[in-house]
């Protein structure tokens, strides 16, 4: 499966939209920063077959969509930017799903690495717990925004490696 060039552009646009979403100075939130334990090893892409790597990327984007689709999120971020953000995430999910369908029967290995999917879910659970503990404060959302941007940048690296594997 060839991830289309539009997928890479969409990832870049997603990062740009998130960059515009900031509402308060992050420098007022230095004390709120938190180590969410990003599962770096799941995005190194070395131990994966292609289909498994795609499923991990899909889970990451799906969880991001879920995180920013809550009413607490809607109350925090600019509605126009959020709508653009959803559109880009939806585009990426569609691309990845189409890719996963093409990979069916191509590889002997399972399409999903269940442990990796669970690891990504637990990562997002930690983020949600943090937001809950911080009562969804503006600074908590600012910290989460930076974290998601960082994780998207890292997942973009995996996507690049997948493209080079074609």
């Amino acid at each position: 499966c060839d991830l289309p060039q539009t997928h890479s552009l969409s990832n870049r646009r997603t990062l740009m939209i998130m960059a515009q979403m900031g509402r308060i100075s992050p420098f007022s939130c230095l004390k709120d920063r938190h180590d969410f334990g990003f599962p770096q090893e799941e995005f190194d892409g070395n131990q994966f077959q292609k289909a498994q790597a795609i499923s991990v990327l899909h889970e990451m984007i799906q969880q991001t969509f879920n995180l920013f689709s809550t009413k607490d999120s809607s109350a925090t971020w600019d509605e126009t930017l959020l709508d653009k953000f959803y559109t880009e995430l939806y585009q990426q999910l569609n691309d990845l799903e189409a890719c996963m369908m093409q990979e069916v029967g191509v590889e002997d290995t399972p399409l999903m690495n269940v442990d990796s999917i669970l690891t990504v879910r637990k990562y997002f659970q930690r983020i949600t717990l943090y937001l809950t503990e911080k009562k969804y404060s503006p600074c908590a959302w600012e910290v989460v925004r930076a974290e998601i941007m960082r994780s998207f940048s890292l997942s973009a690296n995996l996507q690049e490696r997948l493209r080079r594997k074609e």
Epitope: M16, A19, G22, S25, L30, K31, R33, H34, D35
Partner: antibody, heavy 120, light 111 residues
Framework: QVQLQESGTVLARPGASVKMSCKAS????????MHWVKQRPGQGLEWIGV????????TYNQKFKDKAKLTAVTSANTAYMELSSLTNEDSAVYFC?????????????WGQGTTVTVSS | DIVLTQSPASLAVSLGQRATISCRAS??????????MHWYQQKPGQTPKLLIY???NLESGVPARFSGSGSGTDFTLNIHPVEEEDAATYYC?????????FGSGTKLEIK
């Protein structure tokens, strides 16, 4: 590839003002914070402040808040720093540096530096 | 402001040996699992180069002979085995709170 191109050497009189530039290329200028750092001859590094070109948001080291003014022109992919009321203490090399890893606030790419010499 | 005290101010290490540079902060720069301490290398006439971020993470492209450790107020940069090209001044920098500050630098000479 990422590049930060700073303006050349500046010679200025005490009491004067100077404005230096930092032209960015090879990345999305509006989505990365840009730091400015001072280095006096044979001495260490001092953090002056930071600007977000996307919206012009700035944060300063209190020590420099009356000395430095940071601005950016997104259409030119260029950040600027203006230093006012110059004294001999302002003679230094000034670096623009790109913020790295979002809220970790490290600096990955550095301009070559603008040398400011204040002399009467 | 958080003061970063680097020691020693200078050191000379034989080729292939270990260089150890210390950076002590006047206040903790660690919160919730991250230590906001970073290390840079500056060679004469050049710009600083990021080596280590968050106390122990090796920046991409930096040789594995560089390593960082520490948390709270005490941090260390290790270079082993030292090579000729490592002759430079090394700075620590924190981003724990405003203003961000740098250490005064440690000059490494290769014997």
């Amino acid at each position: 590839q990422v590049q930060l191109q700073e303006s050349g050497t500046v010679l200025a009189r005490p009491g004067a003002s100077v404005k230096m530039s930092c032209k960015a290329s090879g990345y999305s200028f509006t989505t990365y914070w840009m730091h400015w750092v001072k280095q006096r001859p044979g001495q260490g590094l001092e953090w002056i402040g930071v600007i977000y070109p996307g919206n012009g948001d700035t944060t300063y080291n209190q020590k420099f808040k009356d000395k430095a003014k940071l601005t950016a022109v997104t259409s030119a992919n260029t950040a600027y720093m203006e230093l006012s009321s110059l004294t001999n203490e302002d003679s230094a090399v000034y670096f623009c540096t790109r913020n790295y890893k979002y809220d970790y606030y490290t600096m990955d790419y550095w301009g070559q530096g603008t040398t400011v010499t204040v002399s009467s | 402001d958080i003061v970063l005290t680097q020691s020693p101010a200078s050191l000379a290490v034989s080729l292939g040996q270990r260089a150890t540079i210390s950076c002590r902060a006047s206040k903790s720069v660690s919160t919730s699992g991250h230590s906001y301490m970073h290390w840079y290398q500056q060679k004469p006439g050049q710009t600083p180069k990021l080596l280590i971020y968050l106390a122990s993470n090796l920046e991409s492209g930096v040789p594995a002979r560089f390593s960082g450790s520490g948390s709270g107020t005490d941090f260390t940069l290790n270079i082993h085995p030292v090579e000729e090209e490592d002759a430079a001044t090394y700075y620590c920098q924190h981003s724990g709170e405003l203003p961000f500050t740098f250490g005064s630098g440690t000059k490494l000479e290769i014997k």
